[in-house]
Amino acid sequence: EDELQVIQPEKSVSVAAGESATLRCAMTSLIPVGPIMWFRGAGAGRELIYNQKEGHFPRVTTVSELTKRNNLDFSISISNITPADAGTYYCVKFRKGSPDDVEFKSGAGTELSVRAKPS
């Protein structure tokens, strides 16, 4: 059985300020069991953008129903984009663990750039 891959098909996405940005992510397998998270940045200081398991993320919606059986699409949409949202976003798969989930594999990242709002 092939090991799970995290696919972020777009290397970059450009969005006008005030619009929503869709960041695409897909898994190639349901195994291992565990949540996905979206981060901005890849280092120790990375910012949590969305956690499938818990948290409050008012500007983030999932493109498909994540709880649906056999779902492999973990794309998100971020509303009301501003220049402060620019950066590289990573979709990361975690393996269920005890007491803490363990990072399993990351997508290659999608760079979000923000254009000035059209006048």
């Epitope: 940045g41 280092g43 120790a44 200081g45 949590l48 803490d100």
Partner: antibody
């Protein structure tokens, strides 16, 4: 408005322990990595420790094995447990929020730790 | 581990003059350099990041330049509130986070 308020500093003897706290407000605490940075009297800034959003911890070599960083997201609070304190740990300890691109964008006012016999 | 060396240690200038502060990295760091200002008894404040980008609310008399190993913070027309200590920081992805030793800009 983002606010970081440190507490728990004081005067201790070498070898003793102290626990610092940092109460955070004005942002979604659980979504950001948090740090302790210190400044000895009349000296520059020295990064001490970071705890990531997934609770991974990092330490400066000078405090490794003696200090422990932790966070309680339900209380929006960051902690630093300092054991086996030394005179060279004397400093103002700042709590600082770090951004995804490794910038310290918000700082507390600091709490003074003095280690003296 | 990268070392950031700031010079001069102290800069004595009068209000209205231009301040030029240097930060040198021991190895190339692209443009991942930030500058902070610290006034006595206060916490540091982010001024500039990615070498040239001013943080929110920072006046345009502050500007950054450089690349690779040599970086400069320039303060045009010093105001009384600009007399402070300035630190550079390497914006590296992983700890330890490195700060320079600081440059004090004092009133002549």
């Amino acid at each position: 408005d983002v606010q970081l308020v440190e507490s728990g500093g004081g005067v201790v003897r070498p070898g003793e322990s102290l626990r610092l706290s940092c109460a955070a407000s004005g942002f979604t605490f659980s979504n950001f990595a948090m740090n302790w940075v210190r400044q000895a009297p009349g000296e520059g800034l020295e990064w001490v420790s970071l705890i990531s959003v997934t609770a991974t911890t990092y330490y400066a070599d000078s405090v490794k094995g003696r200090f422990t960083i932790s966070r309680d997201n339900s209380k929006n609070t960051l902690y630093l447990q300092m054991n086996s304190l030394r005179a060279e740990d004397t400093a103002v300890y700042y709590c600082a929020k770090v951004t995804w691109n490794n910038l310290f964008d918000y700082w507390g006012l600091g709490t003074l730790v003095t280690v003296s016999s | 581990e990268i070392v950031l060396t700031q010079s001069p240690g102290t800069l004595s200038l009068s209000p209205g003059e231009r301040a030029t502060l240097s930060c040198r990295a021991s190895q190339p760091i692209d443009s991942y350099l930030a500058w902070y200002q610290q006034k006595p008894g206060q916490a540091p404040r982010l001024l500039i990041y990615n070498t040239v980008t001013r943080a929110t609310g920072i006046p345009d008399r502050f500007s950054g330049s450089g690349s690779g190993t040599d970086f400069t913070l320039t303060i045009n027309r010093l105001e009384p509130e600009d007399f402070a200590v300035y630190y550079c920081q390497h914006q590296y992805d992983w700890p330890p986070y490195i700060f320079g030793g600081g440059t004090k800009v004092e009133i002549k």
